[in-house]
Interface confidence: low
């Protein structure tokens, strides 16, 4: 069964800087990755970035840089311009559309007590597969 993992890291050098790492564990070719915050995309969440293996990436503030790390994982750098970071208690979700298996999504967040540089364990959400 395919799985999606999500890790959120606070940069050790810049407390206002976060990186979301997402990966897909499963067969099939990835046709699209969507990263959102505040909940799943289309279900209360706000889209931060869309990554397509051929067409490139689209990103929206406060996303700074979205990029592919491997063929099945991505990273999204976020920068908070405010004095205090709202990202610390925020849920980030990654949805992988794997062709032809369908869409798989999981969410993760940075625990409030996390030290800079540590990553949050992935928090699974109900995964919906349509076939």
């Amino acid at each position: 069964t395919p799985e999606v993992w999500v890790q959120v890291q606070m940069e050790a050098t810049e407390l206002s800087s976060f990186t979301v790492h997402c990966g897909f564990l499963g067969p099939g070719s990835i046709s699209l990755v969507t990263v959102s915050w505040g909940g799943p995309d289309g279900a209360g969440g706000t889209k931060l970035a869309v990554l397509h293996p051929e067409l490139g990436t689209r990103q929206w503030a406060p996303a700074r840089q979205a990029r592919w790390e491997t063929q099945s994982s991505i990273s999204l750098a976020l920068e908070d311009s405010g004095a205090s970071s709202p990202f610390a208690n925020t849920t980030f979700c990654c949805k992988f559309a794997s062709f032809p298996e369908g869409s798989w999504e999981s969410c993760g967040s940075l625990p409030p007590s996390s030290d800079p540089g540590l990553s949050a364990p992935p928090t699974p959400v109900p995964i919906l597969r349509a076939d």
Epitope: L32, P100, S103, A130
Partner: antibody, heavy 119, light 106 residues
């Protein structure tokens, strides 16, 4: 302007074969997943086959699996649907459609080509 | 497969009226739902995605709503060019379509 033009439809006997073509223009064909969707005489829409941009991944519903084959020639900007062992229930208007890359939906459709399976 | 059902199957309305078409999914599809419009003798046209986002060039009198298993498409102040058939389709994994709603002039 995105344009999809289907051809190859016609009248065929049950058990026969037919090959549909879809000529694409106005966009980078090799970047998009493409589908064949059919519309039955009762006006129901059914996904028939879909193929990833590279041609490496495909999907068929159970009712056409083993009988229909989707393929593409990215150099010719053309999508194909080879249909064999045709049945009367395959009678429909067949549309070629492009997948939007932001969502799993079809954002452009061709004008369709009609397939009638009858003796 | 997730089954999609639409209601009503057909309805009649006059130019200037407001109509609402509903779509129901057999399972939760979050907000991953698209709507298409098909005019007589033409191919389907992309109308709405993510349940409520209008596709490029679609007039603002169209609006989509809903999430989970219940969805709707509302058309305010019907125009002559709005008459035809409307189909919903979930776009979370392998897509399936609703049976369609035929909107006719009264």
């Amino acid at each position: 302007e995105v344009k999809l033009v289907e051809s190859g439809g016609g009248l065929v006997q049950p058990g026969g074969s037919l090959k549909l073509s879809c000529a694409a223009s106005g966009f980078t064909f090799s970047s998009y997943t493409m589908s064949w969707v059919r519309q039955t005489p009762e006006k129901r829409l059914e996904l028939v086959a879909e193929l990833s941009n590279s041609g490496g991944s495909f999907h068929y519903p159970d009712n056409v699996k083993g009988r229909f084959t989707i393929s593409r020639d990215n150099a010719k900007n053309t999508l194909y649907l080879q249909m064999s062992s045709l049945k009367s229930e395959d009678t429909a208007m067949y549309y070629c459609a492009r997948h939007n890359w932001d969502v799993y939906a079809m954002d452009y459709w061709g004008q369709g080509t009609s397939v009638t399976v009858s003796s | 497969d997730i089954q999609m059902s639409q209601s009503p199957a057909s309805l009649s309305a006059s130019v200037g009226e407001t109509v609402t078409i509903t779509c129901r999914a057999s399972e939760n599809v979050n907000s991953y739902l698209a709507w298409y419009q098909q005019k007589q003798g033409r191919s389907p046209q992309f109308l709405v995605y993510n349940a409520q986002t209008l596709a490029e060039g679609v007039p603002s009198r169209f609006s989509g709503g809903g999430s989970g298993t219940q969805f709707s498409l509302k058309i305010n102040s019907l125009q002559p060019e709005d008459f035809g058939s409307y189909y919903c389709q979930h776009h979370y994994g392998n897509p399936t379509f609703g049976g369609g709603t035929k909107l006719e002039i009264k």
